[in-house]
């Protein structure tokens, strides 16, 4: 831990000769900055410099080449690289007076004579004198006002509101302060503050826009903070709104933005009290150009059962806004001829949905469909390929001679999507074929019997069984199945002999 | 030496208010921005709210931002958190913190359990 | 806000190991960090400040580095009583967000 700095003269105060020089030397285990009280404005004649010494300790030298009644005040040496803005500032002090017998009280800023009390609290009129030893008295509209006083900070007590002037007599001459106007303020736990971007995502060359608005509230410093401040990129307006109520509209604009302005875009309100803080923030993304992304939450091949109502949604990110539109096989998708609708809608400031719909999926609704979003900036599309899955169903079972052999083929065409699986089955004692148990599916490897399976089309499959020889009556069962159903049909198959008995007959 | 000693833990309903103090001595408290840290059962520490030396600001984090107010008074050394609208989540021990170092918290007190619960 | 992630989530050790904690902010916090120590019921203690600074009455065995995003705490020799669980915590501006914390378990 860095022990405290020390200060020379080593002294708790001092008083300094009007017009005279002073100078203030801080020594230091680390590099040590002064705080004093003219602002960087007045302080012209204050000059602070490093020193070099054989000690190994950092000196900071406070220099005043001519001294004034505004030179009064306290001066703090202090490690500038260990302060937190939490605490006070710590370091070493010495507070510095500079009598002048013309000016009796050191002169303030206009904001300093209001002074603010909250909630019956204790305040401090900040009337200080140049000298220590100056008598002072705090007056009001009633007379003299019974209050501690302190040379170095002023009158602290409990006052109503109202004007108070402090005098002072030096050398046989009065002196008065203008009037500190005392001002109470209802201590509210929150202020009312609202952050609104009508945009969080530019490109380059856009102009940013952010406001702040503070409600029922005019005491308020309000202080943005965002990634060109260090620039001084932004401008900054205020507008104050009387009717109905009040209301103060901070504007932050930052012209002609570039990739660099991106980050948190801050407004901190602060009561003139400093007591209620209230922040916003709001994130910025500032893009080289524009630019598009398509997130589909379906696969590049999708089915749809026939007669489904099927949605296909489609996220985009984009900026600036695009124009989307569907294809389909590459044309234009009119909706008005298909019971297909798509529509786009906004979820977020960049963000987009595209539904693409199906009322009643038929089979011509397959094919590719493709998603395609434009701007000024960039182009992307998404094509998948959908299929309409329809039940399987046979659409012929026949049978074919081959003469004298007696060898048959039995020909069963279905048709589906996906393209059906054809099973066979027979039934050898034609008298029992209505109980199922009497039906065995004709496996492949069986002798004299051959079966084979051709596809026709994408959706029509056509399956062949052959006997080679046929000797009695048998039922033939051609059983089509998909995914989305199974149909079957029967064919009786007569042996040649007994079909030539029957044709005599 | 320095003490933070926590106190007004206990067990409280959702939507109950409780308020926490912190006495401190052996330092010069007036100077210190002051913190409340908590700690849920079982989880990790989580900072809460800071309050300046001089009261002029404070922050709070998000997740008790408008339920919690952190308040202080320098004459009595004593920091406070008063606690309304509390719900499950809220449920840990309660620390206050400071310190110089950096902004570091060089001293803690012992903690307080606050246990909201139906 | 600034994330500050902790790996790893545990660690188990022997006594005269050397073990390395790592943490990393979301955003650049420059020196800005410490590292706290806590024990089961107790409340954490301050071991190293402003990423590298030795807090006093602090064992040497500990140490820390690290600047911008990336840090570490290191344990040269680990002693019995060092069994716990440590948080880094960013300590500029606030929220003063901590680590989800690294348990350093007995082997």
């Known amino acids: 831990q860095l022990s405290l700095p020390s200060i020379l003269p080593n002294e708790n105060e001092k008083v300094v000769q009007l017009n005279s020089s002073f100078s203030l030397r801080c020594f230091g285990e680390s590099e040590v900055s002064w705080q004093y009280p003219m602002s960087e404005e007045e302080s012209s004649d204050v000059e602070i410099r490093n020193e070099e010494n054989n000690s190994g300790l950092f000196v900071t030298v406070l220099e005043v080449s001519s001294a004034s009644a505004a030179h009064t005040g306290l001066y703090t040496c202090y490690y500038n690289h260990t302060q937190t803005e939490e605490n006070e500032l710590e370091g070493r002090h010495i507070y510095i007076y500079v009598p002048d017998p013309d000016v009796a009280f050191v002169p303030l800023g206009m904001t300093d004579y209001l002074v603010i009390v909250e909630d019956d609290d204790s305040a401090i009129i900040p009337c200080r004198t140049t000298d220590p030893e100056t008598p002072v008295t705090l007056h009001n509209s009633e007379g003299v006002v019974p209050a501690s006083y302190d040379s170095r900070q002023g009158f602290n007590g409990t006052f109503t509101v109202g004007p108070y002037i402090c005098e002072a007599t030096v050398k046989g001459k009065k002196f008065q302060t203008i009037p500190f106007n005392v001002y109470a303020l209802k201590a509210t736990s929150e202020l009312d503050l609202e952050m609104e971007a009508l945009k969080t995502v530019y490109k380059s060359g856009e102009t940013i826009v952010v406001t702040c608005a503070v409600f029922n509230n005019e005491v308020v410093d309000l202080q943005w903070t965002y990634p060109g401040e260090v620039k001084g990129k932004g401008i900054t307006m205020l507008e104050e709104i009387k009717v109905p109520s009040i209301k103060l509209v901070y504007t932050l604009t930052v012209p002609e933005a570039t990739v660099k302005d991106s980050g948190d875009y801050e407004c901190a309100a602060r009561q003139a009290t400093r007591e209620v803080k209230e922040m916003k923030k709001v994130t910025i993304s500032v893009h080289e150009k524009g630019f598009i992304e398509i997130k589909p939450t379906f696969s590049q091949l999708e089915a749809v059962n026939l007669h489904e109502v099927k949605h296909f949604v489609v996220e985009v990110r984009a900026y600036p806004p695009p124009r989307i539109s569907w294809l389909k096989n590459n044309l234009t998708l009119i909706e008005n001829l298909t019971e297909i609708t798509t529509d786009v809608e906004k979820i977020q400031e960049i963000r987009y949905r595209s539904k693409l719909k199906l009322i009643r999926a038929k089979e011509e609704d397959s094919g590719h469909y493709t998603i395609v979003a434009q701007n000024e900036d960039a182009v992307k599309s998404y094509t998948f390929e959908l299929l309409t899955q329809v039940p399987s169903s046979i659409l012929d079972l026949v049978d074919d001679h081959h003469g004298s052999t007696g060898g048959q083929t039995v020909r069963c065409t279905a048709e589906g999507t996906p393209l059906p699986d054809i099973e066979w089955m027979i039934c050898k004692d034609i008298k029992k074929c209505n109980n199922e148990t009497s039906w065995t599916i004709l496996a492949n490897n069986v002798s004299n019997i051959i079966t084979e399976i051709h596809s026709r089309d994408r959706s029509t499959v056509e399956g062949r069984v052959t006997f080679a020889k046929v000797e009695e009556t048998i039922a033939v069962r051609c059983l089509a199945k998909n995914l989305l159903g199974a149909e079957n049909r029967e064919l009786k198959l007569v042996a040649p002999t007994l079909r030539s008995e029957l044709t005599v007959a | 030496q320095v003490q933070l000693v926590e106190s007004g833990g206990g067990v409280v309903q959702p939507g109950r208010s409780l308020r926490l103090s912190c006495a401190a001595s052996g330092f010069t408290f007036s100077s210190y921005g002051m913190h409340w840290v908590r700690q849920a059962p079982g989880k990790g520490l989580e900072w809460v709210a800071v309050?300046?030396?001089?009261?002029?600001?404070?922050y709070y984090a998000d997740s008790v931002k408008g339920r919690f107010t952190i308040s202080r008074d320098n004459s009595k050394n004593t920091l406070y958190l008063q606690m309304n609208s509390l719900r499950a989540e809220d449920t840990a021990v309660y620390y206050c913190?400071?310190?110089?170092?950096?902004?570091?918290?060089?001293?803690w007190g012992q903690g307080t359990l606050v246990t909201v619960s139906s | 806000d600034i994330q500050m992630t902790q790996s790893p989530s545990s660690v188990s050790a022997s006594v005269g190991d050397r073990v390395t904690i790592t943490c990393r902010a979301s955003q650049d916090i420059s020196s800005w960090l410490a590292w706290y120590q806590q024990k089961a019921g107790k409340a954490p203690k301050l071991l190293i400040y402003?990423?590298?600074s030795l807090q006093s009455g602090v064992p040497s065995r500990f140490s820390g580095s690290g600047s911008g995003t990336d840090f570490t705490l290191t344990i040269s020799s680990l002693q019995p009583e060092d069994f716990a669980t440590y948080y880094c915590?960013?300590?500029?501006?606030?929220?003063?967000?901590f680590g989800q914390g690294t348990k350093v378990e007995i082997k």
């Open positions: 402003a990423a590298s």
């Open positions: 913190a400071g310190g110089r170092s950096r902004g570091a918290f060089d001293f």
């Open positions: 309050i300046w030396y001089d009261r002029s600001n404070k």
């Open positions: 915590q960013r300590t500029n501006s606030f929220p003063r967000t």
